[in-house]
């Protein structure tokens, strides 16, 4: 029950739509038993998929409140999924929903290997040995959830760059264009482990995003959602590096786990960018190899998807 009890509407946000979503969450929490973990996960993701597909009065909230709601949903979802997945039996689970929400989850006894979770628009690779806190006897869980609908609530969310990156960008680019807000290129994804201490991973996690086309000469950034003190948040790049990007895919490497996305910032790239090499048909052969390898994994990988839906 503790998993659900803290996931309630954010204070100060008045939305009928959001209230109904959290009513459903609380109902699921009340009825929850460990044997229902699989069904409960599906019901929560179904409810979230439907919420973000038809956000109703959420889209009439001021932008900042929308960002607070998104932050609250991402944070709570990660906690709830982590808690519930500890009651799943070993194996790989894939769920997908009509509006695009997707969950890939692997539960194992701790093993010394890397794990790859593949989805329609994202691939995640990391070492298994980071999934569990040392001394924790339970199973290890690695999860990845893609939430394309979250982009509606994160429109115009600010990007806060580290001072060093900011300086480097201003040296190599004409500077931020006037309208300022970066464009969300990819789905928003959230990655989690049974170990909730993921602020400083011993070896980095790699994400490969499939996304909308990049506008030529625009800056592509791998970002994560940093939950602010005020319960809201912003996009940030600390601990995340953009390994390479092509027209419709980008590889990111991060030293922590959170919610991630690929943004296109409004910079006009003047020349070759030392922060990020944009891969073209010519050079960058090492990165080309990574892309080719990822492409093969993408098509060979899989695991079936399960559609689960109801009314209401």
């Amino acid at each position: 029950d503790m998993t659900f009890s803290t996931w309630t509407p954010p204070p100060g946000v008045h939305s009928q739509t959001l209230s109904r979503f959290f009513d459903k969450v609380q109902d699921l929490g009340r009825d929850y038993k460990p044997g229902l973990a699989n069904n409960t996960i599906q019901s929560i993701l179904q409810a979230l998929d439907e919420l973000l597909e038809a956000p109703g009065d959420l889209e009439t909230l001021p932008r900042l409140q929308q960002h607070c709601v998104a932050s609250h949903l991402l944070d709570g979802l990660e906690d709830v999924l982590r808690g519930l997945s500890k009651n799943l039996s070993n194996g790989l689970l894939n769920f997908s929903y009509p509006a695009g929400t997707e969950l890939s989850l692997e539960v194992q006894k701790q093993v010394d290997r890397s794990v790859t979770l593949r989805q329609n628009q994202a691939v995640m690779q990391l070492d298994w040995n980071q999934a569990q806190k040392s001394g924790d006897p339970g199973p290890s869980v690695v999860g990845l959830v893609s939430i394309p609908g979250m982009g509606k609530l994160l429109a115009e969310a600010p990007l806060v760059l580290e001072p060093e990156k900011q300086m480097l960008l201003h040296e190599t680019h004409q500077g931020l264009l006037q309208d300022g807000s970066p464009i969300l290129l990819s789905d928003v994804i959230s990655a989690f482990l049974s170990n909730n201490d993921t602020q400083n991973l011993s070896s980095p996690v790699t994400f490969t995003f499939s996304h909308r086309s990049v506008i030529p000469r625009q800056k592509v950034l791998c970002v994560f959602w940093e939950h602010g003190q005020n319960g809201c948040g912003h996009w940030a790049t600390t601990g995340c590096s953009t390994i390479g990007t092509r027209d419709t895919s980008t590889i990111c490497r991060c030293t922590h786990l959170s919610s991630f996305a690929v943004l296109m910032a409004h910079y006009d790239v003047q020349e070759e960018d030392p922060v990020l090499t944009v891969i073209t048909g010519g050079g960058g052969s090492g990165l080309n190899d990574i892309f080719e390898a990822q492409k093969i994994e993408w098509h060979e990988g899989g695991g079936g998807s399960h559609h689960h839906h109801h009314h209401g």
């Epitope: 739509t17 109904r20 956000p55």
Partner: antibody, heavy 118, light 112 residues
């Protein structure tokens, strides 16, 4: 002010087709699920079909499944119901209605009469 | 073929209180919120009560709703001639291939 304005009703022969339209104003159309509900003369209300904001979720009542098609054009703030293979029992006033997530039909169109008769 | 059952008609004098019952099952009323709709003669239905007991803005507090288990009730106090209409309960049904279900409808007649 939320408004749903309907058109497209009329008299049609059994087996024929008709397309109903509903144009919305006064709210963010793309944020809401939309529905069609009908009412046969002198009878009660019957839910017909539902479509979510981006058309990811579409549902039909068993009585119209395979014959009716719901669709929407968010750029035009419009909802449609394509009715094929019409039968006498489809004769009714058809209403479009807005629905909030997990909630009721909070706004209704004025209704349009569809008469199926030879 | 409605799955929510309402009394066909209710009669009362102006100023009186009337209640309309709506009976369902665990897959509809027992599983979701109930709404009530008012349909004045020759007009489209209008939302009267939602989420079992909430009133949209503009609906007077003479109208109230409640739910217990698999049945719901609409109450109208201080009945007025303008309340003469058909009233329908409604909810989502989670049983296979079902969608939104309405009650059979109740005709409220204001006497005198």
């Amino acid at each position: 002010e939320v408004q749903l304005v309907q058109s497209g009703g009329g008299l049609v022969k059994p087996g024929g087709s008709l397309r109903l339209s509903c144009v919305a104003s006064g709210f963010i159309f793309r944020s809401y699920s939309m529905n069609w509900v009908r009412q046969a003369p002198g009878k009660g209300l019957e839910w017909v079909s539902s479509i979510s904001s981006s058309s990811s979720y579409i549902y039909y009542a068993d009585s119209v499944k395979g014959r009716f098609t719901i669709s929407r054009d968010n750029a035009k703030n419009s909802l449609y119901l394509q009715m094929d293979s019409l039968r006498a029992e489809d004769t009714a006033v058809y209403y479009c209605a807005r629905r909030e997530y997990g909630g009721p039909f909070d706004y209704w169109g004025q209704g349009t009469l569809v008469t199926v008769s030879s | 073929q409605s799955v929510l059952t309402q009394p066909p008609s209710v009669f009362a004098a102006p100023g009186e209180k009337v209640t309309i019952s709506c009976s369902g099952s665990s897959s509809n009323i027992g599983n979701d919120y109930v709404s009530w709709y008012q349909q004045l003669p020759g007009t489209a239905p209008k939302l009267l009560i939602y989420d079992n007991n909430k009133r949209p803005s503009g609906i007077p507090d003479r109208f109230s709703g409640s739910k217990s288990g698999t049945s719901a009730t609409l109450g109208i106090t201080g009945l007025q001639t303008g309340d003469e209409a058909d009233y329908y309960c409604g909810t989502w049904d989670s049983s296979l291939s079902a969608g939104y279900v309405f009650g059979t409808g109740t005709k409220v007649t204001v006497l005198g």
